[in-house]
Interface confidence: low
């Protein structure tokens, strides 16, 4: 008996030749001994089977001895063997519908467990291998579960259900709800102004929802609280915003805020999240804030960074061309009686500067300049 | 430091099952998934599989599909390979590995290695 | 699967001397999302278990001694070792993680001249 497996919602056509090149009589049962359709001469007749609304055959091949049976929007229950009767023979196909579907969503936040369901008929034993976007493969039974979504598995998953060496492939799109960077890291100097970014990963049509930041400075024992939002069809409004310092956002997406100065006292991280209209859960974004300051007080020139570095950043001080002091360690470096001239305060990580401060010290009768 | 600690050689006969045990210790968090490679005596490195070991999920080489089961013990953080019907070709050094940097599959956390012996 | 052809089979080079082992792979590793070839390569003394010496085919592994170094892209990858060692003597493999199932080369044996 032949089998032909088919995909819930698709259409099936199985196929029914006879010896003859022509068309003869001929018609399809299912196993119940129930017609669905056949022919009265050139014209399609359809029996009192449940598929009778979408049953069909192609006449433009009868001539050629082929009778097919159509199945459109195919069903789990339409899984039956269906036999072709022409010129005495009796031809028999098994056809085996199955669905595959993921859980309740295919939009999940990252972070999230994915759960595909593979609907089968009754005595079936298939197996399952789902490819996803990234190339790795992930086998089950009847249901398969992938927790812990990445960004990187936003795409088009391919599953391939195996019954009876016998294949078929369902296409699943998977959209991870995530901001496209978990982490970043903003580096400015003292006063500067600053601008947060938080671009999503995906795009839909009506985005709502709301926000906040929660910011816990270096030098702060706890967090708190910088700004509340709304999110209305991609219209950012502001909630409530702390008078210190006192943000400000845009109005439209991506999130974006602006801290009017970058200030020792605001070095440190911060969480953004966004809980989404009819998700559970929320989305997550770090962000850091790292401030140089350069001065010179008396007869010590200081160059410090706050809020979080990590082991491989160096900070120097170096005048003009002549030898820099460097400091791997400490997130200070300094210099005593430093001579005259143009400093250069700079903040690197393995050779590639993230943030430098110039400061003029003038001979010893007069005062610094600050450029 | 992760680290990966396998159970002692096994000596089996033909058509029998082993079943070996790979513990993490050490930063378990940063693992979503311990794989398998075996080799056989003076022979190259070849892929059997991976676990994950907090949802379970299990990803077989189609060599061995069939025949290997992966699973967890998430109370010991455990992880264990199964391979059934041994063969003589089965012999070899079977590894657990993990990756903790950002390297995706390049293992660069590997157990001492557990040697397998099928003989009759 | 991907098929990963390593030559030579074996080389010998003198203290001192450069040595270069190649990896070839039957489709390429390199991915257009990340721009990042999922190629690594090992290093494994007798009774040990391999180490992993580089990763996306050219960010060496931290411990690593800077006289080892990978390069290449796509199809075509080289693993670089500046000025041998006595310690550098073991078996070397690639290996891509691509897509399942991973596959290494059949390696490279490495000795002094």
């Known amino acids: 008996k032949k089998v032909v497996l088919g995909k819930k919602g698709d259409t099936v056509e199985l196929t029914c030749t006879a010896s003859q090149k022509k068309s003869i009589q001929f018609h399809w049962k299912n196993s119940n001994q129930i017609k669905i359709l056949g022919n009265q001469g050139s014209f399609l007749t359809k029996g009192p089977s449940k598929l009778n609304d979408r049953a069909d055959s192609r006449r433009s091949l009868w001539d050629q001895g082929n009778f097919p049976l159509i199945i459109k929007n195919l069903k789990i229950e339409d899984s039956d063997t269906y036999i072709c009767e022409v010129e005495d023979q009796k031809e028999e196909v098994q056809l085996l519908v199955f669905g595959l579907t993921a859980n309740s969503d295919t939009h999940l936040l990252q972070g999230q467990s994915l759960t595909l369901t593979l609907e089968s008929p009754p005595g079936s034993s298939p197996s399952v291998q789902c490819r996803s976007p990234r190339g790795k493969n992930i086998q089950g039974g009847k249901t398969l579960s992938v927790s812990q979504l990445e960004l990187q598995d936003s795409g088009t998953w391919t599953c391939t259900v195996l019954q009876n060496q016998k294949k078929v492939e369902f296409k699943i799109d998977i959209v991870v709800l995530a901001f496209q960077k978990a982490s970043s890291i903003v580096y400015k100097k003292e006063g500067e102004q600053v601008e947060f970014s938080f671009p999503l990963a995906f795009t839909v049509e009506k985005l709502t929802g709301s926000g906040e930041l929660w910011w816990q400075a270096e030098r702060a024992s706890s967090s708190k609280s910088w700004i509340t939002f709304d999110l209305k069809n991609k219209e950012v409004s502001v909630k409530r915003v702390t008078q210190d310092p006192k943000l400000q956002m845009g109005k439209k997406l991506p999130l974006h805020l602006t801290l009017p100065q970058a200030l020792p006292q605001y070095a440190g991280s911060g969480n953004l999240t966004l809980a989404l209209e009819a998700k559970t859960g929320k989305l997550h974004q770090e962000v850091n804030l790292v401030v140089m300051r350069a001065t010179q007080l008396q007869k010590n020139l200081t160059c410090e960074v706050w809020g979080p570095t990590s082991p491989k950043l160096m900070l120097s001080l170096k005048l003009e061309n002549k030898e820099a002091k460097v400091s791997k360690r400490e997130k200070a470096v300094w210099v005593l009686n430093p001579e005259a001239g143009m400093w250069q305060c700079l903040l690197s990580d393995s050779g590639q500067v993230l943030l430098e401060s110039n400061i003029k010290v003038l001979p010893t009768w007069s005062t610094p300049v600050q450029p | 430091q992760v680290q990966l600690v396998q159970s002692g050689a096994e000596v089996k006969k033909p058509g029998a099952s082993v079943k070996v045990s790979c513990k993490a210790s050490?930063?378990?968090?940063?693992?979503?998934?311990i794989t398998w490679v075996r080799q056989a005596p003076g022979q190259g490195l070849e892929w059997v599989g991976w676990?994950?070991?907090?949802?379970?999920?299990?990803g077989y080489s189609q060599k061995f599909q069939g025949r290997v089961t992966m699973t967890r013990d998430t109370s010991t953080s455990t992880v264990y390979m199964e391979l059934s019907s041994l063969r003589s070709e089965d012999t070899a050094v079977y590894y657990c590995?993990?990756?903790?940097?950002?390297?995706?599959?390049?293992?660069?956390?590997w157990g001492q290695g557990t040697t397998v012996t099928v003989s009759s | 699967d991907i098929v990963m052809t390593q030559s030579p089979d074996s080389l010998a080079v003198s203290l001192g001397e450069r040595a270069t082992i190649n990896c070839k792979s039957s489709?390429?590793?390199?991915?257009?999302?990340?721009?990042?070839?999922?190629l690594a390569w090992y290093q494994q003394k007798p009774g040990q278990p391999p180490k992993l010496l580089i990763y996306?085919?050219?960010t060496r592994e931290s411990g690593v001694p800077d006289r080892f170094s990978g390069s290449g892209s796509g199809t075509d990858f080289t693993l670089t070792i500046s000025s041998l060692q006595a310690e550098d003597v073991a078996v070397y493999y690639c290996?891509?993680?691509?897509?399942?199932?991973?596959?290494f080369g059949q390696g490279t044996k490495l000795e002094i001249k």
């Open positions: 996306w085919a050219s």
């Open positions: 676990v994950n070991p907090n949802s379970g999920n299990t």
């Open positions: 050490g930063g378990t968090q940063n693992i979503y998934a």
């Open positions: 590995a993990t990756p903790t940097s950002s390297s995706d599959d390049a293992f660069d956390i």
């Open positions: 290996q891509q993680y691509y897509s399942d199932p991973i596959t």
């Open positions: 489709q390429s590793v390199l991915s257009s999302s990340y721009n990042k070839n999922f």
